[in-house]
């Protein structure tokens, strides 16, 4: 996160760290807890690393430097990458992770509510992006979970800034005209959440941007509302019944 500040314990209890253990262990992506056994993240996090057993998912943590060999983590039972995601295109950048064992909810580890299907009418004015990613383009993973308040921008405005790419209705953009605040490398897959009527909802999944926090280059996020049918289909067919946090 560029231009952010430290988060507090329990402030973003749905935020998880997706880490890979090969020879060393490192944080690669963020994710959002959406049910006892389900994490929503970005498909591109798994490019070149599709093997379930190399991944460790840490939930209920604030500081990555607190992780030791004794820190509990979740393992992956199944990675479900959207069927239309292609490494060569970058659309449909969304994936579900089914955990091997369900998580108990606590003050520091609980799910984020999902938006309604095709939610286009809600005007979100209080949106935040969180993650342990770089604090500048040539930076490093941060120890303490960072947060930053970023306004949504219209898809029309976003398309003007990214004429080389098609900004689809299944994407949502956020950023300041002058730059300075944004997600960055290592924040991929993490949440863009917005508070509406006193409730936090998962509006976007951190996907891509041109650099980080550059002027007139907003961050691009996978629009969760556009994938509600897919999320429900995959979680229900795997579970027998859904255990998602739907909006009230």
């Amino acid at each position: 996160i560029v231009g952010g500040t430290n988060s507090s314990w329990g402030e973003w209890p749905w935020q998880v760290s997706l880490q890979v253990k090969l020879t060393a262990q490192r944080h690669l992506c963020g994710g959002s807890l959406i049910g006892h056994q389900w994490v929503l993240t970005a498909a591109h996090c798994f490019d070149g690393l599709p093997l379930q057993d190399v991944w460790r998912i840490y939930s209920g943590i604030l500081n990555l430097s607190d992780i030791t060999k004794d820190t509990p983590f979740s393992q992956i039972k199944e990675i479900i990458i959207h069927q239309n995601y292609k490494v060569s295109e970058g659309n449909h950048d969304i994936a579900l992770i089914k955990l091997q064992a369900p998580l108990n909810y606590t003050e520091f580890q609980k799910p984020i509510c999902l938006p309604s299907k095709g939610d286009t009418s809600t005007i979100y004015t209080n949106c935040w992006v969180t993650g342990w990613g770089f604090s500048k383009e040539k930076g490093e993973i941060q120890n303490i979970l960072q947060k930053v308040n970023i306004p949504l921008v219209t898809n029309e405005e976003c398309q003007k800034r990214y004429q080389d790419y098609k900004i689809t209705q299944r994407m949502v953009c956020a950023g300041y005209k002058e730059g300075g605040k944004d997600a960055c490398k290592g924040d991929s897959g993490g949440p863009l959440v917005c508070k509406h009527n006193g409730m936090w909802r998962l509006v976007g999944i951190t996907s891509w941007g041109e650099g980080c926090a550059r002027r007139e280059q907003p961050g691009v996020y996978t629009k969760v509302a556009e994938y509600m049918d897919w999320i429900l289909e995959k979680t229900q067919s795997s579970d027998g019944k859904a255990q998602m946090q739907s909006p009230a």
Epitope: A42, H44, D47, K86, V87, S88, E89, G90, D93, G133, D164, Y165, K166, A183, C184, K185, G186, D187, S188, T206, S207, W208, G209, E210, G211, C212
Partner: antibody
């Protein structure tokens, strides 16, 4: 399976014209930037031109600007390179390639993930 | 234009040895737009690495890429017989997109 098949190469005199084609299959052609790259005999690779998915945006190397025109027909899944005012230094194997634009570490990427087998253009009197 | 300079021009190594190929650029290149290709005689180039460090589909893990800014490296940890050929770096950060002149890896 992604396939790119170039055709239209051959021997042409200096000042002459040639039209290369690249037939694409195995992917949604209209979603991708496409590019031409050439390689003179015994030399390295030289980028020639690219075209946007819709065909509305084209860019050329200075060495071919004003003489070559890249175009595409998405209904036929075919990429073209119209080469006019050919010179001896245009002699090369011409490759068409698909330009992938995925996402890595929260940024877009750009690279040539599939290439055709090439077609040889010889400009000589 | 961004010039790409590869070194060495030729690398003579035995199977099993480590190959380190360098690519320097005349201006800053966003590493997401830096790729490496392999070409063997009579064949079209083949993508090895994209985004400076991501291996393309089907590329063995003995190939790795690193670098940032103006200095990029392709490493082949243990040369196999099929690895001999010419390697090119390429940037598509700014037009005109440009290739390095190539490094030829030959059998010692």
């Amino acid at each position: 399976e992604v396939q790119l098949l170039e055709s239209g190469g051959g021997l042409v005199q200096p000042g002459g014209s040639l039209r290369l084609s690249c037939a694409a299959s195995g992917f949604t052609f209209s979603h991708y930037l496409m590019t031409w790259v050439r390689q003179a005999p015994g030399k390295g690779l030289e980028w020639v031109s690219y075209i946007s998915p819709s065909g509305g945006h084209t860019i050329y190397a200075d060495s071919v600007k004003g003489r070559f025109t890249i175009s595409r027909d998405n209904s036929k899944n075919t990429l073209y390179l119209q080469m006019n005012s050919l010179r001896a230094e245009d002699t090369a194997v011409y490759y068409c390639a698909r330009v992938a634009r995925g996402i890595a570490a929260r940024s877009r990427t750009r690279y040539f993930d599939y290439w055709g087998q090439g077609t040889l253009v010889t400009v000589s009197s | 234009d961004i010039q790409m300079t590869q070194s060495p021009g030729t690398l003579s190594l035995s199977p099993g040895e480590r190959a380190t190929l360098s690519c320097r650029t005349s201006q800053f290149v966003n590493s997401n737009y830096l790729a490496w290709y392999q070409q063997t005689p009579g064949q079209a180039p083949r993508l090895l690495i994209y985004g400076a460090s991501s291996r393309a589909t089907g590329i063995p893990d003995r190939f790795s890429g690193t670098g940032y800014g103006t200095d990029f490296t392709l490493t082949i940890s243990r040369l196999e017989p099929e690895d001999y050929g010419t390697y090119y770096c390429q940037q598509s950060s700014r037009t005109p997109w440009t290739f390095g002149q190539g490094t030829r890896v030959e059998i010692k």
